[in-house]
C-alpha cells in the first residue's frame, strides 16, 4: 500500500500553540507514559508526574477547514510525536523548532482532532484511516480501532 | 554555511583515553541533536552515538555504551565524544554530523565533518 | 536494534547505466530511509531522506522508492562522477544503523 494518503500533497501552514501541558487518559483511564527514548505506552498511574505532558499546536491548511491538524509535543522537549504505520508504534522525534509549514511526507507529524463530547481522537493525516491508539501492554500506536482504544479524555492545567 | 570540524584523533594505546571534539559554525548549534559516526579504514560506517539538542537525552551503539560518553557545551559550539577503555577495533575515522534542518534525531544527516583519524600504536 | 542489508555489495556499470541498489531492514521503518553516496577520502554526501525525498542540490537521476522494509536508491544514467560507495540508514529508531555499503565501480 503506498506509504502516504492523497492529503500528503497539502501544505499546512502553523497558527499557534492552541494547548500547554495536557494528560492525556484512555477509556480505560490509563494515562500515557513514556516507555522509553522513542515510544510512549499507557498505563494506570497514580501519580500524574509520571504522565507525560502534551502541547498541541495548530495548523490550517489551503483546502479543508472542516478539521483541526495538529501536532503533538511533549512539553517542554523538542520531541513531537510522529506516525508510522498500522499497528506500529508512534515515535517520537526530536526537531529544533516547531515546523513552520508542513507537506508531504512531513504530514506524519499531524493528526486530525477530533471532539464528540468528552472524547477526543487523533486520526493521522497521513493515515486518515487510522488513529492513534492505546492496546493492553504495549506501546501507544496507530490502529483503526477495536480492540485498541482511539478514544481520549484530555486532563487540563496539570503543570 | 552549517561547518563541523573535528579534532582529537592520533595515535594512542589500547586500554587509554582520548576525548574527540566538534566545533561548530554556521547554525544555532543549541537547537540541533549531534551525531559521532564513525568508519574503520576499508570498512562501512557505523553510527556511534548522539546527544539531543540540551544535551539531556544520549544514545549510544552498543558496541560503544559504557565506554564512549557524548557531550556538548553549547556556549561554545562544541560537541566531545570522550572514549575510554580503547580497543583495537575502535581504529576509524570519526565524523561529528548534524540533521537535516526538520527531524534531527533520529535523523538524516545531512551536515558531516571532514573526520578525524584513531589509530593505535602497537 | 535494527539491522540493515544492502545488496549488492558491489556492481560494475557503465556511464549511462541504470543502476538499481537495494536496501532491507530487519523490520518495519515505514519511510524512515536515507542514501547517502560517499567517494574514497570524503564525508558521507546525503542524497535521499525518508525514502523517496532528494536532497537539495541532488540531481534529479537520483531516485528513491519503498516503505515497510524494502527500499530502492537508484540511478536512472549512470554518470561520471557517480562512482562511489552508497550506503542506506535506517532513521525510524534513535539507534541509527547502517547497511553495508554497495560499491558502483567501472565495468
Known amino acids: 500500500s503506498a506509504p502516504f494518503s492523497f492529503l500528503s500533497n497539502m501544505t499546512y501552514h502553523f497558527i499557534r500553540i492552541i494547548k500547554h501541558e495536557f494528560i492525556l487518559n484512555d477509556t480505560l483511564n490509563q494515562t500515557i507514559i513514556r516507555a522509553n527514548d522513542q515510544y510512549l505506552t499507557a498505563a494506570a498511574i497514580h501519580n500524574l508526574d509520571e504522565a507525560v505532558k502534551f502541547d498541541m499546536g495548530a495548523y490550517t491548511s489551503s483546502k479543508d477547514d472542516t478539521k483541526v491538524p495538529v501536532i503533538l509535543r511533549i512539553s517542554k522537549t523538542q520531541l513531537y510525536v510522529s506516525a508510522q504505520d498500522e499497528d506500529q508504534p508512534v515515535l517520537l522525534k526530536e526537531m529544533p523548532e516547531i515546523p513552520k509549514t508542513i507537506t508531504g511526507s512531513e504530514t506524519n507529524f499531524l493528526f486530525f482532532w477530533e471532539t464528540h463530547g468528552t472524547k477526543n481522537y487523533f486520526i493521522s493525516v497521513a493515515h486518515p484511516n487510522l488513529f492513534i491508539a492505546t492496546k493492553h501492554d504495549n506501546w501507544v500506536c496507530l490502529a483503526k480501532g477495536l480492540p485498541s482504544i482511539t478514544d481520549f479524555q484530555i486532563l487540563e492545567n496539570q503543570a | 554555511q552549517v561547518q563541523l570540524v573535528e579534532s582529537g584523533g592520533g595515535v594512542v594505546q589500547p586500554g587509554r583515553s582520548l576525548r574527540l571534539s566538534c566545533t561548530a559554525s554556521g547554525f544555532t548549534f543549541s537547537m540541533f541533536g549531534v551525531h559521532w559516526v564513525r568508519q574503520a579504514p576499508g570498512k562501512g560506517l557505523e553510527w556511534v552515538a548522539a546527544?539531543?539538542?540540551?544535551?539531556?537525552?544520549?544514545y549510544y551503539a552498543e558496541s560503544v555504551k559504557g565506554r564512549f560518553t557524548i557531550s556538548r557545551d553549547n556556549s561554545k559550539n562544541i560537541l566531545f565524544l570522550q572514549m575510554d577503555s580503547l580497543r583495537l577495533e575502535d581504529t576509524a575515522v570519526y565524523y561529528c554530523?548534524?540533521?537535516?534542518?526538520?527531524?534531527?534525531?533520529?535523523?538524516?544527516?545531512?551536515?558531516w565533518g571532514q573526520g578525524t583519524l584513531v589509530t593505535f600504536s602497537s | 536494534d535494527i539491522q540493515m542489508t544492502q545488496s549488492p555489495s558491489s556492481v560494475s556499470a557503465s556511464v549511462g547505466d541504470r543502476v538499481t541498489i537495494t536496501c532491507r531492514a530487519s523490520q518495519g521503518i515505514s519511510s524512515w530511509l536515507a542514501w547517502y553516496q560517499q567517494k574514497p577520502g570524503k564525508a558521507p554526501k546525503l542524497l535521499i531522506y525518508e525514502a523517496s525525498n532528494l536532497e537539495t542540490g541532488v540531481p534529479s537521476r537520483f531516485s528513491g522508492s519503498g516503505s515497510g522494509s524494502d527500499f530502492t536508491l537508484t540511478i536512472s544514467s549512470l554518470q561520471p562522477e557517480d562512482f562511489a560507495t552508497y550506503y542506506c540508514q535506517q532513521t525510524s529508531s534513535f539507534l541509527l544503523s547502517f547497511g553495508g555499503g554497495t560499491k558502483v565501480e567501472h565495468k
Open positions: 554530523a548534524r540533521g537535516r534542518p526538520k527531524v534531527v534525531i533520529p535523523a538524516p544527516l545531512a551536515h
Open positions: 546527544v539531543s539538542y540540551d544535551g539531556s537525552n544520549k
